[in-house]
Interface confidence: medium
């Protein structure tokens, strides 16, 4: 079911491009775009468990809507409140940086970080 | 995903199993055997920076008699490249390690990873 | 012996363009990232820009990006600097240094003159 | 991008001393980091990489120490050819950056 383009990892069906370069949060978002996906949207904590023990943080696509007063993924979709147990201390004016052992935290949108998008193949 | 078992990894027409118990060498050279696949190789040096992004440590296919004698890879060829601390005569089996390939006693336990190539 | 030669400095008005060229011998220039350093006059050092051994990775200093473009002939164990739109501050001693599979900068080049002025 | 500031940005030794140069990273690096000496109109030299691994050829009274962002190089007995410019570099994710050197000079 996968067939991921160059310098994409392929796992359980969905393409991952990690980035070894750091970016704003809305940089990223713009070259995750720009290569038709998004910005990581994590269905649960042991999606990316083939790199549980890097010890880097990368943008996901989250980010605070104050319209919904809700955290939202790219696609709309409201933060499962599972999936971070410490969600209620972001900071709203943040964006969230990701862990693939599971942890998340907030920091500044204009901060750069590493990035991670997903193309889903089904 | 593709032509990989089912909880591999795909990356550049390789499939890599990301392994995350710990074996002596020599065990995880037969581990992979038993999936089919080798322990890792790495083919070039973008290879091993994506390898270091997804694992910081594991175990490679490149391995030396004594300490006099070459590093060589799985299929016997001299492998070319700097692998940190091999004036230690103790340390025989090399690791992946951040961007960097080290020697390390082959009986510790450390991670290793499997690939075979599409 | 590992040797990097520049060549291709010199004058150029505001807004030229120049290529730089690093012709290197001694090893096998094929396995090894890249990357142009520059030194502006009296000042420190600063990266300008990486590729990776096969060209697929390629990062570029905010401050060229858009304006240089970085590239290599592995046939002719070449690596290249285009600089377009080129600006005052641009003046400095390019030099370029090779990466050991991912250690650092581990050789260098002697350095090449580039001066934008009108 | 990733900032690295050095001190002190000059400094006066006298050969047979021991001299203590830092690196403060704005963000952890893990032990990416590496020392490079420069003389005047010559290219730079790797020293240390790995934060305290020695290049192969340095002679042993150059060593590093630090993980994270906090690092150090020290000459343990300076010799008539260690004085020069030092710089720290960065190489734990692009774009790669140096701090603004470190110079060393004869008291």
């Known amino acids: 079911c996968c067939s991921c383009q160059e310098k994409w990892v392929g796992y359980r069906c969905n393409c991952y491009f990690i980035s070894s370069e750091q970016k704003t949060w809305n940089e990223s978002r713009h070259l995750c775009a720009s290569q038709k996906s998004s910005l990581l949207q994590l269905q649960n904590t042991d999606e990316l468990d083939f790199m549980s023990s890097s010890q880097q943080f990368y943008w996901i696509g989250l980010s605070y809507s104050e319209e919904h007063t809700a955290w939202l993924w790219e696609n709309g979709s409201a933060l499962s409140q599972y999936l971070f147990p410490s969600f209620e201390t972001f900071n709203t004016k943040n964006c969230i940086a990701y862990n693939p052992n599971g942890n998340a935290l907030d920091e500044s949108c204009e901060d750069k970080n590493r990035y991670i998008c997903k193309q889903q193949l089904i | 995903c593709g032509h990989c078992p089912e909880e591999w990894i795909t990356y550049s027409n390789s499939c890599y199993y990301i392994g995350k118990e710990r074996r002596t060498w020599e065990e995880s050279l037969l581990a992979c055997t038993s999936k089919n696949s080798s322990l890792l190789s790495i083919d070039n040096e973008e290879e091993m920076k994506f390898l270091s992004i997804i694992s910081p440590s594991s175990w490679i296919g490149v391995f030396r008699n004594s300490s006099h004698h070459p590093w060589v890879t799985m299929n016997g060829l001299a492998f070319k490249h700097e692998i940190k601390d091999s004036d230690n005569a103790e340390l025989n089996c090399a690791v992946l390690q951040v961007n960097r390939l080290k020697s390390a006693q082959c009986g510790s336990s450390i991670i290793y990873h499997c690939k075979h190539k599409l | 012996e590992v040797q990097l030669v520049e060549s291709g400095g010199g004058l150029v008005k505001p807004g030229g363009s120049l290529r730089l060229s690093c012709a290197a011998s001694g090893f096998t220039f094929s396995s090894h990232s890249m990357n142009w350093v520059r030194q502006a006059p009296g000042k420190g050092l600063e990266w300008v820009s990486a590729?990776?051994?096969?060209?697929?990775?390629?990062y570029y200093a905010d401050s060229v990006k858009g304006r240089f473009t970085i590239s290599r002939d592995n046939a002719k164990n070449s690596l290249y600097l285009q600089m377009n739109s080129l600006r005052a501050e641009d003046t400095a001693v390019y030099y370029c240094a090779r990466e050991e599979w991912g250690l650092p900068f581990d050789y260098w080049g002697q350095g090449i003159l580039v001066t934008v002025s009108s | 991008a990733i900032q690295l500031t050095q001190s002190p940005s000059s400094l006066s030794a006298s050969v047979g001393d021991r001299v203590t140069i830092t690196c403060r990273a704005s963000?952890?690096?893990?032990?990416?980091l590496a020392w490079y000496q420069q003389k005047p109109g010559k290219a730079p030299k790797l020293l240390i990489y790995d934060a305290s691994s020695l290049k192969s050829g340095v002679p042993s009274r150059f060593s590093g120490s630090g993980s994270g962002t906090d690092f150090t190089l020290t000459i343990s007995s300076l010799q008539p050819e260690d004085f020069a410019t030092y710089y720290c570099?960065?190489?734990?994710?692009?774009?790669?950056?140096f701090g603004q050197g470190t110079r060393l000079e004869i008291k």
């Open positions: 570099q960065q190489f734990n994710s692009y774009p790669l950056t």
């Open positions: 590729i990776s051994s096969s060209s697929s990775y390629i």
């Open positions: 963000q952890g690096i893990n032990s990416a």
